[in-house]
């Protein structure tokens, strides 16, 4: 007689990543009886919410409900109805909301309050919406990639089942780039973490980890651009800004009020004799790179070594997974291959930025212009940040792996966040149990 498949004993979890430029909803699934095993949770769905980040709804909070509707309805479809009430929903907001909170705690609270009310209307087990710290964002990103790479499991394998696996238990560092902040997180080699703010201690699956992390607020790719524009417009002789970070022939009018709206440009703010200025692209990688470097203050360091702006950074150690915008930008530029050297990446960026805007629009006809215009700046910014900001070299470049997904799950902080909040990462190594009955069926 044929064996009948027993009903799947699975659980689901939902995490919304409320980033500065957009919100994404992730649905995770795992076998109920294997909650404490490493690597069993996987992503079954990603839904990108159409529209900007939640911090942009500060003047129109009544539209937050409609904004979240399509993705929450998608979650209702994907997760079996019988599981709805026991499926936890978490929303974590990152640097866009940190910046809003710096401007007004009251406005940030109002946005989160409406988000909470909207999410409470769904049949899931809503667990709250909060602004996570930069330290948490870095830590959870590090947990996610190492969990997915199998770095926390004690079993050593003679074969590799996941990409990038070096068959040892040495963890990967995590490099995360968002729109408003960027995080660097790794285990330094026998190095004291000189600043307590950057030190994390974890005990995971019976092993202790001393982890360095830092989140650079205002150094995500979007806020870095606003910083650069605010810095450069200070010395412009009129309302034309000839910008090497945009393609030759590209033109864009920017409102000065938009430029100074973010706390990230406050240090460059000045009274200008015009309300608007026009960016005119000149497409020069080297000049763009030089302009970006002026955003990193490397003249002051109260520690043995620093990244920039006086922030401690230990010597880099081991392999790194670079994800989120590090991956999206480099993937667009076709520069994610392990075989592409740093020199080659720089060469390709020089050629790309020098291409006329009209040519670029023709070559990438399917890409929205507002995104297409960003890649010269963003690619140059990534190189500047990794090389001059974090001190990667031409040699250590090969230790950076640009990662979008690992085993079908997106690299990012959301999985680590859910694993932590659902207590699915034990401090001690779970005892290996005999096969459960479900294994025999």
């Amino acid at each position: 007689t044929q064996n009948k498949a027993l009903p799947e004993n699975v659980k689901y979890g939902i995490v919304l990543d409320a980033g500065s430029s957009h919100t994404s909803l992730y649905i995770y699934k795992w076998p109920a009886e294997k909650e404490n095993d490493t690597g069993v949770v996987h992503q079954v769905e990603e839904c990108r919410v159409k529209g900007p980040g939640i911090s942009k709804f500060v003047q129109k909070v009544n539209e937050i409900g409609i904004y979240l509707t399509d993705c929450m309805e998608r979650a209702r479809e994907v997760i079996p109805r019988s599981q709805h009430q026991e499926t936890p929903v978490y929303l974590g907001a990152t640097a866009g909301m940190r910046l809003l909170r710096m401007e007004s705690e009251e406005l940030a609270d109002r946005v989160l309050d409406v988000v909470e009310r909207s999410l409470s209307n769904y049949p899931f087990d809503f667990q709250g919406a909060r602004i996570i710290t930069g330290q948490e964002e870095g830590a959870y990103g590090w947990i996610t990639i190492n969990y997915l790479l199998g770095k926390f499991s004690q079993k050593t394998r003679w074969f590799s089942i996941v990409p990038y696996e070096t068959n040892n238990q040495e963890t990967f560092g995590a490099l995360d780039l968002g729109g408003a902040s960027t995080q660097v997180t790794f285990v330094p080699q026998n190095q004291t973490i000189e600043s307590p703010d950057n030190a994390l201690q974890f005990r995971l699956y019976g092993k202790d980890y001393n982890v360095y992390t830092h989140s650079f607020l205002c150094y995500g790719k979007d806020q870095a651009l606003w910083q650069k524009l605010a810095k450069d417009i200070q010395v412009a002789s009129n309302e034309i800004l000839r910008d090497p970070c945009f393609h030759p022939g590209y033109k864009k009018v920017v409102n000065v009020s938009d430029l100074y709206k973010t706390p990230c440009t406050k240090r460059f703010e000045m009274t200008l004799p015009f309300q608007q200025f026009e960016i005119q692209g000149i497409g020069n990688y080297q000049q763009c790179h030089q302009s970006i470097l002026e955003l990193f203050n490397t003249s002051y360091c109260p520690y043995s070594q620093c990244a920039f702006n006086g922030i401690f950074l230990p010597p880099l150690q081991g392999d790194f997974g670079a994800f989120s915008a590090f991956y999206f930008v480099m993937k667009f530029l076709n520069l994610t291959s392990e075989k592409v050297s740093q020199e080659k990446v720089t060469e390709m960026m020089k050629k790309f930025c020098a291409q006329p805007w009209e040519e670029i629009k023709t070559s990438y006809a399917g890409v929205k212009e507002k995104y297409l215009s960003e890649y010269c700046f963003s690619g140059t910014y990534i190189l500047s940040l990794l090389l001059q900001g974090y001190h990667f070299t031409a040699d250590s470049w090969e230790h950076i792996h640009f990662i979008g997904k690992i085993q079908g799950s997106d690299a990012g902080w959301t999985l680590g966040y859910m694993l932590n909040l659902t207590n699915m990462i034990p401090a001690e190594q779970p005892l290996s149990t005999p096969l459960s009955h479900s294994t025999y069926v």
């Epitope: 430029s21 529209g51 942009k56 399509d70 979007d222």
Partner: nanobody, 122 residues
């Protein structure tokens, strides 16, 4: 730039019905959602109903069960079917295109129609 033009307003008795239309000069697919707002004299503009590009709808509690929003993508038009109208529904009704994401996280522009008057009175 997409222009939005509302029509269908007028004077109606309590308990009556009206159907408002909002015609867009360009594709309504350029918006993430389309919404109907209203503004009564001396009051703030409030969201009445909205429909997403995915076809999901949201309503203000005060109109649930009485109003229905729909869209005809081929005609680039959004409708608001209003029934069981009450005097407190009297207002200028505005159509809004709720936009997409923008250049480097810039604030997105709001696209509004000029409004159509709805008066519920016996």
């Amino acid at each position: 730039q997409v222009q939005l033009v509302e029509s269908g307003g007028g004077l109606v008795q309590p308990g009556g019905s009206l159907r408002l239309s909002c015609a867009a000069s360009g594709s309504i697919f350029s918006f993430n959602a389309m919404g109907w707002y209203r503004q009564a004299p001396g009051k703030q503009r409030e969201l009445v109903a909205a429909i997403t590009s995915g076809g999901n709808t949201n309503y203000a509690d005060s109109v649930k069960g009485r109003f229905a929003i729909s869209r005809d993508n081929a005609k680039n038009t959004v409708y608001l079917q209003m029934s069981s109208l009450k005097p407190e529904d009297t207002a200028v009704y505005y159509c809004k295109g709720i936009g997409g994401s923008t250049w480097f996280g810039e604030d997105e522009p709001d696209y509004w129609g000029q409004g159509t008057q709805v008066t519920v009175s016996s």
